[in-house]
C-alpha cells in the first residue's frame, strides 16, 4: 500500500511537515505535537519585540 502525501502544498504554502494529519508541527521545538498544545499565531503590533508564540504548520489534507 503506497502512502499518499502527508499534506498538500500550494504555491505559497509552507513546506510539508513530518506530522500525520492528527498532529501539528511545533516550529520552535521542531517536532510534532497535539495541535491543542500550540497557541494560534496572532499578528504582532508594529514595533513589538516580544517573542512570538509557538506556532504550527498543519495544512489541511
Amino acid at each position: 500500500m503506497r502512502r499518499g502525501p502527508r499534506s498538500l502544498r500550494g504555491r505559497d504554502a509552507p513546506a510539508p511537515t513530518p506530522c500525520v494529519p492528527a498532529e501539528c508541527f511545533d516550529l520552535l521545538a521542531r517536532h510534532c505535537v497535539a495541535c491543542g498544545l500550540l497557541r494560534t499565531p496572532r499578528p504582532k503590533p508594529a514595533g513589538a519585540s516580544s517573542p512570538a508564540p509557538r506556532t504550527a504548520l498543519q495544512p489541511q489534507e
Epitope: 513530518p18 506530522c19 497535539a34 495541535c35 498544545l37 494560534t40 506556532t55 504550527a56 489541511q60
Partner: antibody, heavy 118, light 113 residues
Framework: EVKLVESGGGLVQPGGSLRLSCAIS????????MSWVRQPPGKALEWLGF??????????EYNPSVKGRFTISRDNSQSIFYLQMNTLRAEDSATYYC?????????WGQGTTVTVSA | DIVMSQSPSSLAVSVGEKVTMSCKSS????????????LAWYQQKPGQSPKLLIY???TRESGVPDRFTGSGSGTDFTLTISSVKAEDLAVYYC?????????FGGGTKLEIK
C-alpha cells in the same frame, strides 16, 4: 490491505508483567504512528499512548494513567510493535487494541485480552 | 484531561428512522489556525473492534456510508444516521485528539427495535 494482529494476552497475577505484540502488514511500518487502546469488559475505550514514525524519531506519548508502568516500542525489522506492561493491577484487565494513527485512530486490530487476577 | 460526555447512553430505534447522538467536550477542540475540530467518531459492533467513521468532526472516512454524518464545532458535536439499518446496531464513541491524553466518551449504544 492494512492488517493489525495483537497477541500476548492472557492471565497474569497482580504485580506481574506482560508484553503484548502487534504484527503489522499492508503498509510501510516505519512511516506510521502506532497506538495502543484498551477496553475493560463492558466499559468505554481508554487511549494508552502511541509511538511516532521514523521521521519523528520514534518518540512516544503516554496517558498519565499508565506512564511509568507501560512502555511502547517497535521492531521495524519484523513489522511488530509492543506494549510492555509492568506492575499490573486488577484494573488493567481489558481487551487491548493496537491502532494505526493518521487522521485519528484509522485502523484497529481485533484485540487481545488481558486478565489480572490472583 | 479533556472530558468527553456522550448522550444518550442508549437508544432504541426502528429501521429507517433518523438518529442523532451528542458528544460534548469540556474544552474547545477547534484549532483556529486550520479550522479543524480534532474530534473523531467510531463504531463498535458487538464482538468487534472499533472502526473509524468520522474524523475532523465532519469528514467521513473512506468507505463509510453517506447516511453517517458528523457535525458541530468547538465543544458540541453530533453524529447523525439519516436512515438506520439493522447493521448499524453498535456502540458509537466520540474521541478527542486535540491534546494528550486522547480521551473517549462513554459511548452511545444503538439498539434496533
Amino acid at each position: 490491505e492494512v492488517k493489525l494482529v495483537e497477541s500476548g494476552g492472557g492471565l497474569v497475577q497482580p504485580g506481574g508483567s506482560l508484553r503484548l505484540s502487534c504484527a503489522i502488514s499492508g503498509f510501510t511500518v516505519t512511516a506510521y504512528y502506532m497506538s495502543w487502546v484498551r477496553q475493560p469488559p463492558g466499559k468505554a475505550l481508554e487511549w494508552l499512548g502511541f509511538i511516532r514514525d521514523k521521521a519523528n524519531g520514534y518518540t512516544t506519548e503516554y496517558n498519565p494513567s499508565v506512564k511509568g508502568r507501560f512502555t511502547i516500542s517497535r521492531d521495524n525489522s519484523q513489522s511488530i510493535f509492543y506494549l510492555q506492561m509492568n506492575t499490573l493491577r486488577a484494573e488493567d484487565s481489558a481487551t487491548y487494541y493496537c491502532a494505526q494513527v493518521r487522521r485519528a485512530l484509522d485502523y484497529w486490530g481485533q484485540g487481545t485480552t488481558v486478565t489480572v487476577s490472583a | 484531561d479533556i472530558v468527553m460526555s456522550q448522550s444518550p447512553s442508549s437508544l432504541a430505534v426502528s429501521v429507517g428512522e433518523k438518529v442523532t447522538m451528542s458528544c460534548k467536550s469540556s474544552q474547545s477542540l477547534l484549532y483556529s489556525s486550520n479550522q479543524n475540530n480534532y474530534l473523531a467518531w467510531y463504531q463498535q459492533k458487538p464482538g468487534q473492534s472499533p472502526k473509524l467513521l468520522i474524523y475532523w468532526a465532519s469528514t467521513r472516512e473512506s468507505g463509510v456510508p453517506d447516511r453517517f454524518t458528523g457535525s458541530g464545532s468547538g465543544t458540541d458535536f453530533t453524529l447523525t444516521i439519516s436512515s438506520v439499518k439493522a447493521e448499524d446496531l453498535a456502540v458509537y464513541y466520540c474521541q478527542q485528539y486535540y491534546t494528550y491524553p486522547y480521551t473517549f466518551g462513554g459511548g452511545t449504544k444503538l439498539e434496533i427495535k
